[in-house]
Structures are given as structure tokens and as C-alpha cells.
């Protein structure tokens, strides 16, 4: 093959090599960019900045190598358009620092930074942590800070992410109330902070106020939907990002629903209860208090993390005709009480028969000396004789 005269030449089926001295000062308009998985750049003294726009359209890029070039600055969002990037080699450039944000969201298997005049500061605490934790092949590089010694020896006692304290109401909140939340941010080199409110939807009208170091958030005219929803305060500095999530409990009255009994392993009378705080429950059977036992008991399903409603069953283990009747579930919390009833029929009463009915003359054999205490159930056998349930 003839030698490639261009600044960048194809390499393999989806690679590109740019090694001609000083041919590039940016990575705009690389040929065949959208299908590239590998990009190798060397000896580009004029390539000093790597920014978001430079890698736009390189969505398939897996390996990026920029070595022995003039790279001084990599923007925190430079790799936003290359989410599949797994190997990044920026060795032997002029980088003094690299933000934690640059590699956030990437699954880098390899990060090479040797041969750069790194400046030890809290901004490289994340890289020191990679070295400590053996990530990305960093330990093997024995990174040095220019004139300061090994990165591993950099003092880091004062290098912490921001500290957040979110103040929530110190009393319960009712539907229709306004709630003021305050997020107090402490730490060095604070850069940005804000609220994440993606879960709130129609739960309240939101008004943000203030800025670093004290952010205010008013949730106006709250609804019961606000329960179990995360309100998150976040803040970033050169070391990293911190988030704290809180939830606001909004009181509302108990409610209850009952559904038709279903036969599973045991019989189940399904129910749903809601309310904040969580309601206390009581069952009635034919109007009288139902005392739960190991044969009849309430069982809750695993609750959903983001809602107050609880689903469950009144479990009945092998119920007979004596368990047929009216089941009522009472739910109560400080703000209301509710009840729901349902008729359940588990088994016909074998002792109920109409004297007018003809008596069948063909009997199934019955062992009159049977001492078994277990009810015997025979299905689809006709004609049917006398069945006795003992117990």
C-alpha cells in the first residue's frame, strides 16, 4: 500500500492514526469520525486543548491516544460524546491537571498520564485514589508531580468533597402546606451546587432561592404524592461531588381496598392500604374481631420504595366452610379511618343439604372407622355421596 500523505491515515477497519508532525491543532472534521473505534495521535505540538466539540460525532470511540503532543487542557465535559471510551492515553503532554469530571461516567479500563508535568493539588485527589485502589493501570505509572515528588505522597487531609446538611421541617407536613428546605454547603473550592427534583413531578410547586453556600427550596402546596420522593441537594468542588437526599413526610388519612379472595399456595384476601403515617390494621370476621393465628394471618408484600401504599394478603391456610363469611379490614391513622368488606366463600358446607333432594343410591365407599383428622377433598367425582369434614 502507498504511504498515506494526509495528516491522519486509516489504521485497520475502524482506526485512525495522526502522526505527521504539527499537522493538527484540533480534532474537528476527522475523516470517517462516526465509525471510529480507535484514534491515535502523536507529535501534535499545536493540539493544546481538548474540548466537548472536538469529539462530537465520535460515539463509537473505544481507544483514544494523544501522546507526545502539546495538550495542556482537557475540558471536564470533553468525553461527553464518547461514552464507550475504555482506554485513554494522554502521556507525554503538557497537562498539569485533569478534572475528576473528565472521567466521570466513563468505564475506563486504562488511563495513562505518565510524562506530564502534573501539579499536585486537591484537584488530583481523585487520581491519587485511583492509584491507591489500583484502578485504570494508574499504580504502575508511578506518577510524579512536577518538582513535588510522587503523587502517592501528596498530602490529602484537606482534600474532601463538599459537606452537605439539608434542613427539613421539624414537624409533620399536611397536604396544602408550604415546606422550606435549606441545603447548607461547606468545603473548600466550591464550584457548583443545586437541587435534583426529577422525582417530584406534580407533588408540589417548586421555587428555588439562594446560592452557595446556602440553597433554599420551597415546596408549595404539597400533595400526598410527595411522600417517598427524593429531594436531592448536590454540590461539587475540584475534589468531587457530594449528594444528600431527603424525603418529606406529608400526612394524609388512611384508605383501604379489598379484593376478591384468590387461591394460591394458601388462600389470599388481597388488600391495599395507604396513609401517612402508615395505618394500623384490624380484621373483622362477620363483624367480630378476627384474632390472627398461624393459620390466618396478615402478610405484606415487599413495599415499593417510592410510594406509601402497601399491598398484602390476609392468608388463610386450608380454610373450610367455617371460614366462609364477611371479612372487613379496618385501617386507621391519626388523620382518618377507613374500612372495606368482602364476602369470601372457600368451601361449601358439607352439612347443608335440602331434604327435598333425591338421595343418591350409588355411594363412594366410606371408611366409617376412619380416625383421620384431616378433611378429605374429592373433586369431580359423581355421583357424590356423604363427605364428612372433621376438625
Amino acid at each position: 500500500a502507498a504511504p498515506c500523505p494526509d495528516a491522519c491515515c486509516p489504521h485497520g477497519s475502524s482506526g485512525l492514526r495522526c502522526t505527521r508532525d504539527g499537522a493538527l491543532d484540533s480534532l474537528h472534521h476527522l475523516p470517517g469520525a462516526e465509525n471510529l473505534t480507535e484514534l491515535y495521535i502523536e507529535n501534535q505540538q499545536h493540539l493544546q486543548h481538548l474540548e466537548l466539540r472536538d469529539l462530537r460525532g465520535l460515539g463509537e470511540l473505544r481507544n483514544l491516544t494523544i501522546v507526545k503532543s502539546g495538550l495542556r487542557f482537557v475540558a471536564p465535559d470533553a468525553f461527553h460524546f464518547t461514552p464507550r471510551l475504555s482506554r485513554l492515553n494522554l502521556s507525554f503532554n503538557a497537562l498539569e491537571s485533569l478534572s475528576w469530571k473528565t472521567v466521570q461516567g466513563l468505564s475506563l479500563q486504562e488511563l495513562v498520564l505518565s510524562g506530564n508535568p502534573l501539579h499536585c493539588s486537591c484537584a488530583l485527589r481523585w487520581l491519587q485514589r485511583w492509584e491507591e485502589e489500583g484502578l485504570g493501570g494508574v499504580p504502575e505509572q508511578k506518577l510524579q508531580c512536577h518538582g513535588q515528588g510522587p503523587l502517592a505522597h501528596m498530602p490529602n487531609a484537606s482534600c474532601g468533597v463538599p459537606t452537605l446538611k439539608v434542613q427539613v421541617p421539624n414537624a409533620s407536613v399536611d397536604v396544602g402546606d408550604d415546606v422550606l428546605l435549606r441545603c447548607q454547603v461547606e468545603g473548600r473550592g466550591l464550584e457548583q451546587a443545586g437541587w435534583i427534583l426529577t422525582e417530584l413531578e406534580q407533588s408540589a410547586t417548586v421555587m428555588k432561592s439562594g446560592g452557595l453556600p446556602s440553597l433554599g427550596l420551597t415546596l408549595a402546596n404539597v400533595t400526598s404524592d410527595l411522600n417517598r420522593k427524593n429531594v436531592t441537594c448536590w454540590a461539587e468542588n475540584d475534589v468531587g461531588r457530594a449528594e444528600v437526599s431527603v424525603q418529606v413526610n406529608v400526612s394524609f388519612p388512611a384508605s383501604v381496598q379489598l379484593h376478591t379472595a384468590v387461591e394460591m399456595h394458601h388462600w389470599c384476601i388481597p388488600f391495599s392500604v395507604d396513609g401517612q403515617p402508615a395505618p394500623s390494621l384490624r380484621w373483622l370476621f362477620n363483624g367480630s374481631v378476627l384474632n390472627e393465628t398461624s393459620f390466618i394471618f396478615t402478610e405484606f408484600l415487599e413495599p415499593a420504595a417510592n410510594e406509601t401504599v402497601r399491598h398484602g394478603c390476609l392468608r388463610l391456610n386450608q380454610p373450610t366452610h367455617v371460614n366462609n363469611g364477611n371479612y372487613t379490614l379496618l385501617a386507621a391513622n391519626p388523620f382518618g379511618q377507613a374500612s372495606a368488606s368482602i364476602m369470601a366463600a372457600f368451601m361449601d358446607n358439607p352439612f347443608e343439604f335440602n331434604p327435598e333432594d333425591p338421595i343418591p343410591v350409588s355411594f363412594s365407599p366410606v371408611d366409617t372407622n376412619s380416625t383421620s383428622g384431616d378433611p378429605v377433598e374429592k373433586k369431580d367425582e359423581t355421583p357424590f355421596g356423604v363427605s364428612v369434614a372433621v376438625g
Partner: antibody, heavy 123, light 106 residues
């Protein structure tokens, strides 16, 4: 000093109406829930109405639901109880009470009470 | 609704003695609160959420209990403790009060 001062009580005929007021001072009224509690002669205390801090939520026991309405005017630091279709059994001393703030657990009691105003329903 | 039954209805003790007032709930409640009411006065919060002493209340008052049985104890009676004492539940709608215990100081 927290003060709650009820007014508006008096003698009213069965079926009549009355509006009680409670003037609050010594605390930030709009940050507290409020309730009305009554005590008939020789009887136990009976809670009759609750209102949230902003007035968006109200609760009543079945004995007065549909007849009594609790409201508040936070700009005037005043709590109200509108009582309609009054019955002889509504005769009592009516207290306004402040909901305490003892943490986000819903089970706070009433920590300050007014001196009460007497309502007599009789023909 | 949850019915609160207080016992005894009347308790007559001498100064310095220990007073034990009981409150029984018809169903389990999360917490119990206690109030003191002197003749011609409004109720005064003594104990909140079963065992916490309200602001300004002397330490001779204490509360305990759980579920359906709760107790207010006055460790060493003072003459000014003569009053009616009410228990109160806020756990389940409608909120209810006990019938009261009248404490007399001999």
C-alpha cells in the same frame, strides 16, 4: 410568652350558629398546626377540629363533621371555628390549642391551650 | 375509635407519697400524652410521646408504657399536684382523651 385567647361563645338556640375566634400571640402562628377541643360539664375532653399550618388540610371527628368548619387567617394570627346546626350536646367550654413541634413523627400533642370560651345550646 | 379508660377515677394520697395513674387503650397506640387540669383552668401538657417531660414540668412527673397500657407516675406528691389528669392519644383517628383521674391531696 405564648398566649391563646378565645372569644365568641354565648347562648344559642338549637339549630343556630356561632363563630368562635382564637387570637394567638407570642409565637409564629403560621408555623404551627392548631386544634379546637371542647369539654362538656363533668365530661372528658373531646377533640373537635384540626387545621394544618397553611390551612390546606382540616380534620374533624364524625360528631361534628359537616356542621363545624375550622379556618385560620395567618396574617391576623387568628383561628376560627364556625359552628352550624348546633345541638344541645354541643354545649361545652371550647379551647383552642396549639400543636406542638416535637419532630417529624405525627404524634405530637397540643402544648398550649387557651382559657376557653363557653358555648351553651339551649332553647 | 380508640377508647381510653383511666383508673382509678379518684386517687387520694398524702404529700410525699407516690402516685400511679393508669390509662388503658381499647386498641394499641403508638404513644400516649398526659395533661393536668386544675379547677377553672385549661389543660397543661405534662408528658408527650409516652415518656418525655414537657417544658417547665418538674422531674417528679414521669410516663411509661406501650401498646395498650400506659402509666403516669408522680414520685413524691406536692400539694399543688391536686388536679384532674387526662391521657390522650394522637395515634389513631379520631383523637381521644381518657375520662380522667381526680388526684386529691390529703
Amino acid at each position: 410568652e405564648v398566649q391563646l385567647l378565645e372569644s365568641g361563645g354565648g347562648l344559642v338556640q338549637p339549630g343556630g350558629s356561632l363563630r368562635l375566634s382564637c387570637a394567638a400571640s407570642g409565637f409564629t402562628f403560621s408555623t404551627y398546626t392548631m386544634s379546637w377541643v371542647r369539654q362538656a360539664p363533668g365530661k372528658r375532653l373531646e377533640w373537635v377540629a384540626y387545621i394544618s399550618k397553611g390551612g390546606g388540610s382540616t380534620y374533624y371527628p364524625d360528631t361534628v363533621k359537616g356542621r363545624f368548619t375550622i379556618s385560620r387567617d395567618n396574617s391576623k394570627n387568628t383561628l376560627y371555628l364556625q359552628m352550624n346546626s348546633l345541638r344541645a350536646e354541643d354545649t361545652a367550654v371550647y379551647y383552642c390549642a396549639r400543636g406542638a413541634m416535637y419532630g417529624n413523627d405525627f404524634f405530637y400533642p397540643m402544648d398550649y391551650w387557651g382559657q376557653g370560651t363557653t358555648v351553651t345550646v339551649s332553647s | 375509635q380508640i377508647v381510653l379508660t383511666q383508673s382509678p377515677a379518684t386517687l387520694s394520697l398524702s404529700p410525699g407519697e407516690r402516685a400511679t395513674l393508669s390509662c388503658s387503650a381499647s386498641s394499641s397506640v403508638s404513644y400516649m400524652h398526659w395533661y393536668q387540669q386544675k379547677p377553672g383552668q385549661s389543660p397543661r401538657l405534662l408528658i408527650y410521646t409516652t415518656s418525655n417531660l414537657a417544658s417547665g414540668i418538674p422531674s417528679r412527673f414521669s410516663g411509661s408504657g406501650s401498646g395498650t397500657d400506659f402509666t403516669l407516675t408522680i414520685s413524691s406528691l406536692e400539694p399543688e399536684d391536686a388536679a384532674d389528669y387526662y391521657c390522650h392519644q394522637w395515634s389513631s383517628y379520631p383523637w381521644t382523651f381518657g375520662g380522667g383521674t381526680k388526684l386529691e391531696i390529703k
